[in-house]
């Protein structure tokens, strides 16, 4: 009963339905299933298509622009589990721009183990409000279900039996509303007793064995599960794989020869991107983790003595890193056999991504070229780079080459970083924010001092737009209140005091004291500092009575730690020597103050002598809240209440239904509009700044997701005519 068909690899089915038949005998898709970009399909094309054997997808299910598909109830009638081992942008189920889809209909879907659900822009899609997602996955709050027909209240979702006045389906509470749960007009949502947890239950409601996941045909029997909570071995669900078996892909047990076959298949094939599987911690995994290397006799990962070398040989001797994706191809490499060219114009979360993928590189056999990388602020993402051999050099005999990097301000933090360049010269031109002092420091540290010729390091085009400080500014006075910080610092004057144009004060919220000026920044980033320009103080001739420059920072958040530093702004001197000074980063916390009022107080009387009062914490605690004060006062009774005859025929039932405390924002909006209509004279309030900000964030989040979707989904046609897993994927 358990997984009756085959285990199939992940599939990307696009353009037409021909490849869909590859799903025919699949019980498990080990990977993801993407069905997308079918513009010529019609409803009748899907009529006789059904894959009843499919029970589990280990990664994610993505449906995008498949025309004519109206329901998934016949396509995947027995899909029970989506494990979400690997997710699509944090989602395990994505239904996006499915123009004809009327209902999901995945009536056997019982568990999404990891990740959440994104159902967006499906303008015919109903039966969404009738699904209790909390019975299927844990992180319901991360679901993103918007811009579907269901949003417009145009859906007449009718669960089985409703038409005959019966309630056949289980009802559960969401947002205080007790609603019948169903997937379609003929399929209830199966709601097991909560005591069964995610193990599932039989049709009669008895809990499955604790090793089951989602469903079973008999209770208390690990061989009668529909899917396994942990691992599958020989027709049985088990908690862990016993020797001589190994855990594979987070869901099944395999023996040594299975893992060995995978290893050799990849080793012997010329296919790029396949994995030479290895054994580590009782698992058969694609590669040894960081710090381990493979013992070729038994495929076991053994700890490296010292750092593990992972030599990456570059095709054609060099590789251009122009995106995070190309950087990912070097993930885990410690030695680069060849040369690297960094040419990064933009991207998302760049510094962190580059460090994650290039941060282990210790050695480059050829040269390193940083060219027109407008997005880079620092090279500190090359966290472990210690050696550039220069065995092959860039034209002109350069082993380190930096050209036209508009925002590059720091190479490395030379107090913490050592770099040796065995042979070859340095080249620096058109790096306007990179101070010459930084370049000269690199010459000293890397051992290249004296190798450079006159024009290798341009004096006019490096650091010409930077404030290149060489003195330390010290803060002399700091005072705080709940929303202000008053700062003063020691005066600084360059040799010609007229060169001092003023000071720049940089600050930002910093919950942790780990902020640096450049780390984690990129020129496209949003983690920038707030900058205040401050005029220089009046200059006194008496050095003892010099005014200390300063600034009163206003409008700060109470009880918040700020990172602050200050630097000088000086004119560019003709002698090509720019003076300046900069402080260390300091951390200052504003004082606490009164919290804002507690939100949404709701009072409900649950008996003749009790009132239950609930509220939400204030939006701005402005400190550590230790307690709340509750005041009450007895009110005089309204005499009308006693005099009214409650049996009067004319009395109408209250028209407003009672809504429970803390209902969702959506239902609050709905109530609001009702009142506005009835009043007739009221207009809706203008949106608050926080509402506007929230909407902007939401819109930006939507765009990010769409960009991600398009980048993943639309791929150029391959010229080779591969088959199977290597099928050309037209866009």
């Amino acid at each position: 009963h358990l997984y009756p068909g085959e285990v199939c690899p992940g599939m990307d089915i696009r353009n037409n339905l021909t490849r869909l038949h590859e799903l025919e005998n699949c019980s498990v898709i080990e990977g993801h299933l993407q069905i997308l970009l079918m513009f010529k399909t019609r409803p009748e094309d899907f009529r006789d298509l059904s894959f009843p054997k499919l029970i589990m997808i280990t990664d994610y299910l993505l449906l995008f622009r498949v025309y004519g598909l109206e329901s998934l109830k016949d396509l995947f009638p027995n899909l029970t589990v989506i494990r979400g081992s690997r997710l699509f942008f944090n989602y395990a189920l994505v239904i996006f721009e499915m123009v004809h889809l009327k209902e999901l209909g995945l009536y056997n879907l019982m568990n999404i183990t990891r990740g959440s659900v994104r159902i967006e822009k499906n303008n015919e899609l109903c039966y969404l409000a009738t699904i209790d997602w909390s019975r299927i996955l844990d992180s319901v709050e991360d679901n993103y279900i918007v811009l579907n027909k269901d949003d417009n209240e145009e859906c007449g979702d009718i669960c089985p039996g409703t038409a005959k006045g019966k309630t056949n389906c289980p009802a559960t509470v969401i947002n205080g509303q007790f609603v019948e749960r169903c997937w379609t007009h003929s399929h209830c949502q199966k709601v097991c007793p909560t005591i069964c947890k995610s193990h599932g239950c039989t049709a009669e409601g008895l809990c499955c064995h604790s090793e089951c996941l989602g469903n079973c045909s008999q209770p208390d029997d690990p061989t009668k599960c529909v899917a396994c909570r942990n691992f599958y071995l020989d027709g049985r669900c088990v908690e862990t794989c016993p020797p001589p078996y190994y855990h594979f892909q987070d869901w099944r047990c395999v023996n040594f020869s299975f893992c060995q076959d995978l290893h050799h298949k990849c080793k012997n094939s010329r296919r790029q991107g396949c994995h030479q599987y290895v054994i580590h911690n009782n698992k058969c995994i694609p590669e040894c983790p960081s710090g381990y290397t493979m013992n070729s006799s038994n495929l076991l990962c053994t700890p490296c003595l010292g750092p593990c070398p992972k030599v990456c040989h570059l095709l054609e001797g060099e590789k251009t890193i122009d995106s995070v994706t190309s950087a990912q191809e070097l993930r885990g490499c410690t030695v680069i056999n060849g040369s690297l060219i960094i040419n990064i114009r933009g991207g998302n979360n760049l510094a962190a991504e580059l460090e994650a993928n290039l941060g282990l590189i210790e050695e480059i056999s050829g040269y390193l070229k940083i060219r027109r990388s407008y997005a880079l602020v620092s090279l500190s993402f090359f966290r472990k780079l210690r050696l550039i051999r220069g065995e092959t050099l860039e034209i002109g005999n350069y082993s380190f080459y930096a050209l036209d990097n508009q925002n590059l301000r720091q190479l490395w933090d030379w107090s913490k970083h050592n770099l040796t360049i065995t042979q070859g010269k340095l080249f620096f031109h058109y790096n306007p924010k990179l101070c010459l002092s930084e370049i000269h420091k690199m010459e000293e540290v890397s051992g290249t001092k004296g190798r450079q010729e006159r024009n290798d390091i341009a004096l006019k085009t490096n650091g010409d737009q930077a404030s290149c400080e060489n003195e330390l500014l010290k803060f002399s006075y700091i005072r705080t209140s709940f929303d202000k910080i008053l700062l003063r610092w020691e005066p600084y004057w360059p040799p010609d005091f007229r060169d001092l144009l003023g000071f720049m004060l940089f600050y930002k919220e910093a919950p942790y004291q780990n902020v640096t000026e450049f780390d984690g920044q990129d020129a496209c980033g949003s983690n920038s500092w707030t900058v205040v320009d401050i005029d220089p103080p009046l200059r006194s001739n008496d050095p003892k009575s010099q005014n200390h420059p300063g600034w009163l920072m206003r409008g700060l958040k109470p009880w918040t730690q700020y990172a602050i530093f200050v630097k000088t702004l000086v004119t560019f001197s003709d002698e090509r020597r720019t003076y300046g000074a900069k402080s260390d980063i300091i951390y200052v916390q504003t004082d606490a103050t009164n919290p804002s009022v507690p939100l949404d107080p709701i009072s409900v009387s649950n008996s003749s002598s009790q009132i239950i009062l609930k509220w939400k914490p204030p939006s701005d605690p402005n400190g550590n809240i230790t307690h709340y004060l509750v005041f009450w006062e007895r009110q005089a009774e309204d005499s009308e209440l006693f005099e009214l005859d409650y049996c009067l025929k004319g009395l109408k039932l209250p028209s407003r239904t009672w809504s429970p405390p803390f209902e969702s924002e959506d239902s609050q909006k709905h109530n609001q509009s009702e009142y506005e209509d009835s009043a007739g004279e009221c207009c809706s309030c203008p949106k608050t700044d926080s509402q506007i900000l929230k909407e902007l964030e939401e819109s930006s989040f939507r765009k990010t997701f769409e960009d991600y979707l398009h980048n993943v989904v639309f791929v150029p046609r391959k010229t080779s005519s591969g088959t199977g897993a290597e099928d050309p994927r037209p866009s």
Epitope: A171, P193, T194, C196, G205, P219, D220, D221
Partner: antibody, heavy 116, light 107 residues
Framework: EIQLQQSGPVLVKPGASVKMSCKAA????????MNWVKQSHGKSLEWIGD????????SYNQHFKGKATLTVDKSSSTAYMELNSLTSEDSAVYYC?????????WGQGTSVTVSS | DVQITQSPSYLAASPGETITINCRAS??????LAWYQEKPGKTNKLLIY???TLQSGIPSRFSGSGSGTDFTLTISSLEPEDFAMYYC?????????FGAGTKLELK
């Protein structure tokens, strides 16, 4: 045939502890949860908690947390319940019963009398 | 916790009659209610679970109905061996809770 055989009646002094057993036969012991239920004299039934013999995981009724401890010995297919700091309130018949939720097989009960 | 109110506490009937026992839950428990029979000197017997599913080996004169908060056990054409104590129990959520019981006596 499925059977749950419970240990015999006990008389204990207040403040003492007692550990009773429930030996299972006729099915795979590790496949079904074991429940424990209290029935005070002339009163209804009260669920104490359950244990999953497969992995030792337990769920307790809040009223019995700290009072009852559930354990199993897989090798002998036996479930145990220990009651500590006994008072006269703990005098009752204690049943073990198989299966999570709707309990399909019950033991004959162990009578515990707490008296000085 | 889900409170279960069972009624009546006592019920006298004669063989051949049909009787009903009711249980009401303090909140919805879907269909997840079980019925047990308790007889002196015998182990407790599961009769019905999930509101209406008959446990194997139980005669078909026993039937259950209801969902949400209101449930009923019906015994049609009573047999002499049916005179016993009956309990209902919700098996939807922890902690599992029982009704106070109904004593079915011979009239």
């Amino acid at each position: 045939e499925i059977q749950l055989q419970q240990s015999g009646p006990v008389l204990v002094k207040p403040g003492a502890s007692v550990k009773m057993s429930c030996k299972a036969a006729g099915y795979t012991f590790t496949d079904s949860y074991m429940n424990w239920v209290k029935q005070s004299h002339g009163k209804s039934l009260e669920w104490i908690g359950d244990i999953n013999p497969y992995n030792g995981g337990t769920s307790y009724n809040q009223h019995f947390k700290g009072k009852a401890t559930l354990t199993v010995d897989k090798s002998s297919s036996t479930a145990y319940m220990e009651l500590n700091s006994l008072t006269s309130e703990d005098s009752a018949v204690y049943y073990c019963a198989r299966r999570r939720g709707a309990m399909d097989y019950w033991g004959q009960g162990t009578s515990v009398t707490v008296s000085s | 916790d889900v409170q279960i109110t069972q009624s009546p506490s006592y019920l006298a009937a004669s063989p051949g009659e049909t009787i009903t026992i009711n249980c009401r839950a303090s909140k919805s428990i879907s269909k997840y209610l079980a019925w047990y029979q308790e007889k002196p000197g015998k182990t407790n017997k599961l009769l019905i679970y999930s509101g209406s599913t008959l446990q194997s080996g139980i005669p078909s004169r026993f039937s259950g109905s209801g969902s949400g908060t209101d449930f009923t056990l019906t015994i049609s054409s009573l047999e002499p061996e049916d005179f016993a104590m009956y309990y209902c129990q919700q098996h939807n959520e922890y902690p599992l809770t029982f009704g106070a019981g109904t004593k079915l006596e011979l009239k």
